[in-house]
Interface confidence: low
């Protein structure tokens, strides 16, 4: 059991108050984290509370302002980037969001040597992406889908690509589907370690079908947003990778990197690029049927000025039980010999573990093992490998940081974080300086988050970077709900759950139950993290019990659980939520006439199917921005788990797993359907089709749309959304307003 550390004495209970919805909507109890912006082994930058950019030297203990808030304010900068030679800073302003990661902005270059903005050959606006070279102060940027290079900030730009066209050809930035479902970045260009070469992707969306939706705005006629968006089975983007010598960019021009023959024989994806040295690069490719991935190590041929990818340097990763990798195929972390690498993939027992690959994948040496999973490799130095896993005390929803000494034989393993602040901190991430001389640990819970600085050699804590004292003080008179993380064993499946209980929880009483579900493949909802959010309020003030359950298809508990949903989305995820609810009822404190379920996105899909399961368990439920048919969602994501919607592949299950097919079953539940009309991700089409099917079946339901809002329903819509959902649930549970 994980209980929130108690901060309450009975004598003080009369001064305590419950959380309010206003607390949540105002972000009153939000926490801060501190991630150093490392610029060397012992120095980092940080933006102070008053917006100065301050350089800290850990070893001398000194700090000084490199850029004043006055300079930042002069161009309304909201972000900055220091050139590696420390001569220039770019200042970012006029931030304009596009999709999940992408945005455009205006960039100004500030010369630290003379304290002036660089004049002459200013950057065009708005820029889609801009970055410094890893050494010196070269600039690469993307403007109007083309890539430009500046040897120095004041120099005229050198245009690298010329074929960029809105919604057609993307150079150095991903198109919609690659941004959201493959790269998870706003950029698609990569500098070599010393800035000699620049690699970039070109995405050709010419043949991709376009999703079009109205953006109502304030004008007489709505605008139409057009996005090349490949849905399941549709034509996909065509990707090519090029590398250009940035020292002599016009000398040979961009050189295309060849695609491995076994990949190029049918539709494929590029999944990531990792530079090894200035003259060695590693590319990862994936077949459209995403169970085969190829890692290809390519070398620069000086004589031909080309990139050579010998077959002997191709490493194949294949899954026979599901798709390749977890959510994404993992990326390699190269060792100092610049050819061998460490990588996380499934071991023979079906658990994701770190392997060391020196020549072939078949001869890989397994570095970690057990019935738990290695989750991320943070850093490999000459003598240590730092990684995170959920091994400690067998709680899948924890993250601890480990160090393996690879310099000694046999390698020894040490948990760096397990016993640091055991009650408060069970879910960590880390950020390392150059050569791992120092690192920051960021603890997300279950207690109040705390960020600390550590010595990379001894692991000693040097100082606290952020401990959220103000938050701790603000929570002293708040009746927070209790949280417990436990597991259910059902038919050889382990279902981990988190239960959020009202502050004065009494097992002899009956409480309404709200299930919060996401449930998407390779997701995890049951995590030992701190949060004061809407469901905290529902437990604290409205006396509900809230439960989150990780069923089949969820991550970090082995391939058997993860790949159980392969080619069968919408079946086991729903079954496992229902199974858990039945178990919760057996616990004796749930009012079985007042059970609800809600979810967003994939969770909206699962909650809809659970409501339409015909079990009679749920009185009501909410689906926010749900997927309603996998034929409506993006190819890269959907086909990874479902295959293709063709007769000879998996069309039958595509058809059987829609929400619309179960319209009749909504007759006996109260259903609230919510969607933003400008959702670029899960298109409004999904909810429109649910609504149409319910109307055609003459089933009553409630609905709310948010005009011109995307998948995140942000801003004032957030307040309206949670207020609306609160009213709906209170009405469903017969709670007074």
């Amino acid at each position: 059991i994980v209980l929130r550390p108690s901060r309450v004495h009975n004598s003080e209970e009369n001064t305590m108050r419950a959380l309010t919805l206003k607390d949540i909507l105002n972000g009153t109890f939000s926490y801060k984290t501190f991630f150093p912006n490392w610029i060397s082994g012992q120095e980092y930058l940080h933006q102070s509370a008053d917006n100065n950019i301050v350089l800290y030297n850990i070893e001398t203990g000194q700090s000084y302002t490199i850029l004043s808030n006055r300079t930042m304010k002069s161009v309304n900068a909201s972000n900055y980037g220091l050139s590696p030679d420390r001569q220039f800073v770019y200042l970012e302003s006029d931030y304009s969001k596009l999709w999940r990661y992408s945005y455009t902005a205006t960039y100004y270059i500030y010369d630290l040597s003379n304290g002036e903005f660089v004049r002459g050959n200013e950057l065009p606006r708005p820029i889609q992406y801009l970055c410094w070279s890893p050494v010196g102060s070269k600039l690469a940027y993307v403007y109007q889908n083309n890539i430009y290079l500046k040897q120095r900030p004041g120099d005229p730009p050198f245009q690298i690509t010329f074929n960029g066209r809105e919604n057609k050809i993307f150079n150095g930035i991903p198109d919609w589907v690659y941004e959201e479902e493959m790269l998870a970045t706003k950029y698609a260009l990569w500098w070599s370690p010393n800035g000699k070469f620049l690699a970039y992707a070109e995405f050709n969306d010419t043949d991709i079908p376009v999703i079009a939706y109205s953006y109502y705005g304030d004008e007489q006629y709505p605008r139409t947003i057009n996005i090349p968006y490949p849905k399941a089975g549709a034509k996909n983007p065509v990707v090519r990778i090029f590398i250009i010598d940035t020292t002599y960019p016009a000398y040979v021009g961009p050189q295309e990197v060849p695609v491995p023959a076994m990949i190029a024989s049918s539709d494929y994806y590029f999944s990531w690029l990792t530079w090894v040295t200035d003259e060695r690069v590693c590319l990862q490719w994936l077949k459209r049927v995403q169970n085969v991935s190829v890692l290809s190590i390519c070398d620069f041929r000086e004589d031909w000025q080309t990139w050579d990818c010998p077959k002997t340097q191709e490493h194949i990763e294949e899954s026979r039980t599901g798709w390749a990798g977890g959510f994404f195929v993992s990326t390699p972390v190269f060792s100092y010999d610049a050819i061998s690498y460490y990588k996380i993939f499934s071991d023979k027992d079906g658990y994701k573990h770190i392997h060391y690959i020196k020549d072939t994948v078949e001869n890989a040496i397994q570095i970690t093992s057990g019935k738990w999973e290695a989750i991320n490799i943070f850093r490999v130095t000459q003598d240590s490998l730092f990684y995170s896993s959920n091994e400690f005390e067998e709680y899948p929803g924890r993250r601890n940081i480990y160090r393996i000494s690879i310099g000694s034989y046999p390698p020894s393993k040490k948990c760096v974080t397990c016993h640091l602040r055991k009650e408060r901190c069970q879910y960590y991430t880390a950020s390392f300086s150059d050569y791992a001389k120092y690192y920051a640990l960021v603890c997300y819970g279950p207690g109040i988050p705390i960020s600390t600085l550590h010595d990379g050699r001894t692991d000693q804590e040097i100082k606290i970077l952020e401990e959220n004292k103000e938050l701790e003080n603000a929570l002293k008179n708040i009746q927070l709900p209790k949280e417990e993380i436990k597991k259910l064993e059902v038919d050889e499946i382990t279902l981990w759950y988190k239960m959020i209980l009202p502050p004065q929880f009494d097992r002899s009483k009956k409480y309404p139950l709200l299930i919060q579900v996401y449930g998407g493949p390779c997701s995890q909802s049951v995590r030992s993290v701190f949060a004061v959010n809407w469901i905290s309020y529902l437990a604290s003030k409205e006396g509900m019990v809230i439960a989150l359950v990780d069923g089949r298809g969820t991550a970090f508990q082995g391939d058997k659980l993860l790949y159980a949903v392969y080619r069968k989305l919408g079946v086991y995820e729903v079954e496992d939520q229902i199974t858990a609810v039945r178990k919760f009822i057996e616990m004796g404190f749930i009012d079985e006439k007042r059970i609800a379920i809600w979810g967003w996105s994939y969770g909206g899909y699962v909650s809809s199917l659970a409501l339409a399961s015909g079990t009679g368990l749920f009185k009501c439920g909410i689906a926010v921005a749900p997927v309603s048919s996998w034929e409506y969602y993006a190819s890269v994501y959907t086909e990874r788990f479902m295959g293709l919607p063709t007769k000879d592949d998996n069309l039958e299950h595509y058809k059987n797993s829609t929400v619309m097919a179960r319209a009749e079953y909504f007759r006996n539940v109260d259903y609230l359907l919510i969607h933003g009309t400008a959702d670029d991700n899960v298109h409004f089409q999904n909810s429109a089709q649910i609504a149409k099917a319910l109307v055609n079946a003459q089933v009553d339901f409630q609905a709310m749309w948010y005009s011109d809002q995307n998948h995140g329903l942000s801003g004032l819509s957030t307040n309206h959304l949670y207020t609306h959902m609160t009213h709906f649930l209170k009405q469903c549970f017969s709670l007074s307003d």
Epitope: D155, P156, F158, Q159, I160, T161, F162, N163, G164, N171, E202, P249, A250, Y251, V252, G253, P254, Q255, E256, D303, W304, Q305, T306
Partner: antibody, heavy 129, light 107 residues
Framework: HVQLQESGPGLVKPSETLSLTCTVS??????????WGWIRQTPGKGLEWIGS???????NYNPSLKSRVTISVDTSKNQFSLKLSSVTAADTAVYYC?????????????????????WGQGTMVTVSS | ETTLTQSPGTLSLSPGERATLSCRAS???????LAWYQQKPGQAPRLLMY???NRAAGVPDRFSGSGSGTDFTLTISRLEPEDFAVYYC????????FGQGTKVEIK
């Protein structure tokens, strides 16, 4: 490293066709990143670009010579060739083949220039009866 | 067609001196698509600069290029004995054209 070598007759009679071949060694002619050109140099007119070809076969000629010029490519032999018809004494010159490094993005819709970064040593062609 | 005019026709200087060569275009050179070449007697031209200001591989940093639009300059900061040659500019809008050349000779 890449080297270019011109070959062909040094003497051509007026009104006949001048034929030269350029052999590329040390690198492939079938690269996205290069085009291949012919330039000539006369004492009177200095350096004059004749035309260029891309390995796909698309060509770009100097308008002043276009009616008389044909440039072709043989990727299997790693060669490209120049034919200049109806020659006169004014066509007497040193003929160079050269590699152009592109900065136009692929696929090429037309050959656009960069600079000629590698040249052959040149071959003298005299037009005389 | 863009005509390139180089000046002066001949430049007589001593080793160690600075050389400034000019190239003027009859119309704007697209995207500064301008190159400079060096040619010695009996040899093919050698690429020095491209894109008006970028040095080609292996070219010493005493050579620098500048300019945009219609006026371009090649500067040799300190003449070495091997720098005495004829220098040509070239633009690569179609058709590609060359300047008539500037001869840098030993004074």
């Amino acid at each position: 490293h890449v080297q270019l070598q011109e070959s062909g007759p040094g003497l051509v009679k007026p009104s006949e066709t001048l034929s030269l071949t350029c052999t590329v060694s040390g690198g492939s002619i079938s690269s996205n990143n290069y085009y291949w050109g012919w330039i000539r140099q006369t004492p009177g007119k200095g350096l004059e670009w004749i035309g260029s070809i891309y390995y796909s076969g698309s060509t770009n000629y100097n308008p002043s010579l276009k009616s008389r010029v044909t440039i072709s490519v043989d990727t299997s032999k790693n060669q490209f060739s120049l034919k200049l018809s109806s020659v006169t004494a004014a066509d007497t010159a040193v003929y160079y083949c050269a590699r152009g490094a592109r900065w136009q993005a692929r696929p090429a819709t037309r050959i656009d220039g960069v600079a000629f970064d590698i040249w052959g040593q040149g071959t003298m062609v005299t037009v005389s009866s | 067609e863009t005509t390139l005019t180089q000046s002066p026709g001949t430049l007589s200087l001593s080793p160690g001196e600075r050389a400034t060569l000019s190239c003027r275009a009859s119309q704007t050179v697209t995207r500064n698509y301008l190159a400079w070449y060096q040619q010695k007697p009996g040899q093919a031209p050698r690429l020095l600069m491209y894109g008006a200001s970028n040095r080609a591989a292996g070219v010493p940093d005493r050579f620098s290029g500048s300019g945009s639009g219609t006026d371009f300059t090649l500067t040799i900061s300190r003449l070495e004995p091997e720098d005495f040659a004829v220098y040509y500019c070239q633009q690569f809008g179609s058709p590609y054209t060359f300047g008539q050349g500037t001869k840098v000779e030993i004074k």
